[in-house]
């Protein structure tokens, strides 16, 4: 008896539900009364769930598992695991016995995204070039253990004098603390990137340190070197800072935010007063922070049309400006898969598989692969259409000649968010099964 499971580990986020796919090929005349099905932990053989004597025998695993009773007769023995925990990670064996028997093991890889790192500085006052400072980067509640990278404002890796520690809490989630010791130059940006190696999720933060200098009257305007990435519909902060000279008061400040290319006014502050938003009433300054040299702009309810470069122009006695890029993004939905034709399929038939994913930005990259993970590049047609909001719907069509059976996976990647959404369909000649939605 051939029992089939995915070759790749099933990745599940902590707290979500996961489907461990398993299928078998029932012979003609098969009835559920003949089915004996066991799910167990591969290493310890601990019982997880079973089906015997025509009946679901229930969960033996903290009441968090379920079969798909309506699909069993078609050979779908998949297991639903609810409220996934770190402790669930490992290999699960699907054992099927009718007349013949067979088994296969599927790996569950548990993951949890790391929080946006918080950065602290010690000491954090009266810094001068040549001082040694300790920068701590902390990120919480991720799994598995993170990879931590430090770099300067030019993107050059900083590897010396870094100490990283990771501690697991009772749920098995890790808190990561990474400490960088540096000698300050004239000024510098230090970035910490916390990567989840399973999710390929990067969480990063940076701190810009501008040591005090003897006052020259010069206004140095600083913005992040990297684009600010903002999800459609959320709020974004375009950071901008300047170095106020001693005795500076807000009455002296003249601040303009404008679109870099067209010079269209976005927001301004002059004559000691916030002159308000000139940009659809969706912008705001941080009035309590202006006196300390924080000229950052809050942009609310970000739209695709906001993408581009914004210039922060500061004039006191001296003046200066700098431009910051806003990169807008929207995650793609989980792809839906359709099949044409979808009945009476035989080896040798040509089928058209359509993979559709909606409302993402920017344009997606689409990849097809077979059950073994081998890329399928021939006979693929992908189209992307933007709606009125500028969000893309992607439709990718794969034409294949069926073998005896096969799994076809479609992966829709958002190149900015590095977010992958995937769907798959398994075709087994007669009958055909769609894996349950994860």
């Amino acid at each position: 008896l051939e029992v089939q499971v995915p070759e790749d580990p099933v990745v599940a986020l902590v707290g979500t539900d996961a489907t461990l796919c398993c299928s078998f090929s029932p012979e003609p005349g098969f009835s559920l009364a003949q089915l004996n099905l066991i799910w167990q932990l591969t290493d310890t053989k601990q019982l997880v769930h079973s089906f015997a004597e025509g009946q679901d025998q229930g969960s033996a695993y903290a009441n968090r598992t379920a079969l798909f009773p309506d699909l069993l007769a078609q050979g779908n023995a998949s297991l639903r695991l609810q409220r996934v925990r770190v402790a669930d990670e490992g290999s699960f064996t699907c054992f099927v016995s009718i007349r013949d028997f067979g088994s296969a093991a599927v790996s569950l890889q548990v993951a949890a995204p790391y929080s946006k790192p918080s950065m602290t500085l010690e000491p954090n006052k009266d810094l001068r070039p040549g001082d040694t400072v300790t920068i701590t980067c902390s990120s919480y509640q991720g799994y598995p253990e993170a990879e931590v990278f430090w770099q300067d404002g030019q993107g050059v890796p900083l590897t010396g004098n870094v100490t990283t520690s990771q501690m697991a809490n009772e749920q098995g989630l890790f808190d990561v603390h990474s400490i960088l010791r540096v000698v300050l130059g004239a000024n510098g940006t230090y970035s910490c990137l916390v990567r989840n190696p399973v999710l390929q999720q990067d969480a990063h933060s940076s701190v810009t340190i501008t040591p005090q200098r003897s006052p020259t009257g010069a206004v140095e305007v600083q913005v992040p070197e990297d684009p600010v990435v903002a999800l459609v519909g959320t709020d974004a902060t375009l950071r901008c800072s300047f170095s106020p000279e001693p005795g500076f008061s807000l009455a002296q400040l003249n601040l303009i935010w404008q679109l870099t290319d067209t010079k269209q006014l976005v927001h301004s502050f002059t004559e000691g007063r916030d002159q308000g938003s000139a940009y659809a009433n969706r912008t705001a300054l941080f009035p309590d922070l202006l006196a300390q040299g924080n000229a950052s702009l809050r942009l609310q309810r970000v739209r695709v049309a906001d993408e581009g470069s914004f210039t922060c122009f500061v004039s006191i006695r001296d003046f200066g400006s700098a431009a910051v890029s806003l990169q807008v993004a929207a995650p793609y939905s989980k792809p839906s898969m359709t099949l044409e034709p979808n009945k009476d399929l035989r080896p040798g038939d040509t089928v058209t598989i359509t993979c559709s994913s909606y409302r993402g930005y920017p344009e997606a990259e689409v990849f097809w692969q077979d059950g073994q993970g081998v890329p399928l590049t021939g006979n693929v047609t992908t189209s992307q259409m933007a709606n009125e909001q500028g969000l893309f719907d992607v439709h990718s069509v794969l034409r294949v000649v069926l073998g005896a059976n096969g799994t076809y996976s479609c992966l829709v990647r958002n190149p900015v968010l590095q977010q992958d959404a995937h769907g798959s369909v398994t075709i087994t000649g007669q009958p055909m099964t769609f894996p349950p939605e994860a």
């Epitope: 206004v219 140095e220 001296d318």
Partner: nanobody, 113 residues
């Protein structure tokens, strides 16, 4: 006095203060017209600001070692005829005359058609 299409560089030297601590600007006043902003440069020279219709033909620069600010003008035309003033910026917008504390006496540039 220059010909239409010529180039010209104006210089303005300052004394009696810390030149490198101040932003500087150029203005001009054509016959019978109001004085208008041309360009400004920040104290260290890292930022420049131009009137919309001047950018491209005019370039402002400075040499803090020589306490001097320059205005390079190219493709001059008759309508560029004016008295050109150099000024030391105080508090305010670079394009506003009221932001400038000290002014030069001005130099007349005449562009012959």
């Amino acid at each position: 006095l220059v010909q239409d299409g010529d180039s010209l560089r104006l210089s303005c030297a300052a004394s009696g203060g810390t030149f490198s601590s101040y932003a500087m600007g150029w203005f001009r006043q054509a016959p019978g017209k109001e004085r208008e902003f041309v360009a400004a440069i920040s104290s260290e020279g890292g930022s420049t600001y131009y009137a919309d219709n001047m950018e491209g033909r005019f370039t402002i620069s400075r040499d803090n070692a020589k306490n001097t600010v320059y205005l390079q003008m190219s493709s001059l035309r008759a309508e560029d005829t004016a008295v050109y003033y150099c000024a030391v910026k105080g508090v305010g917008w670079p394009q506003e005359q009221a932001s400038y504390d000290y002014w030069g006496q001005g130099t007349l540039v005449t562009v012959k058609p």
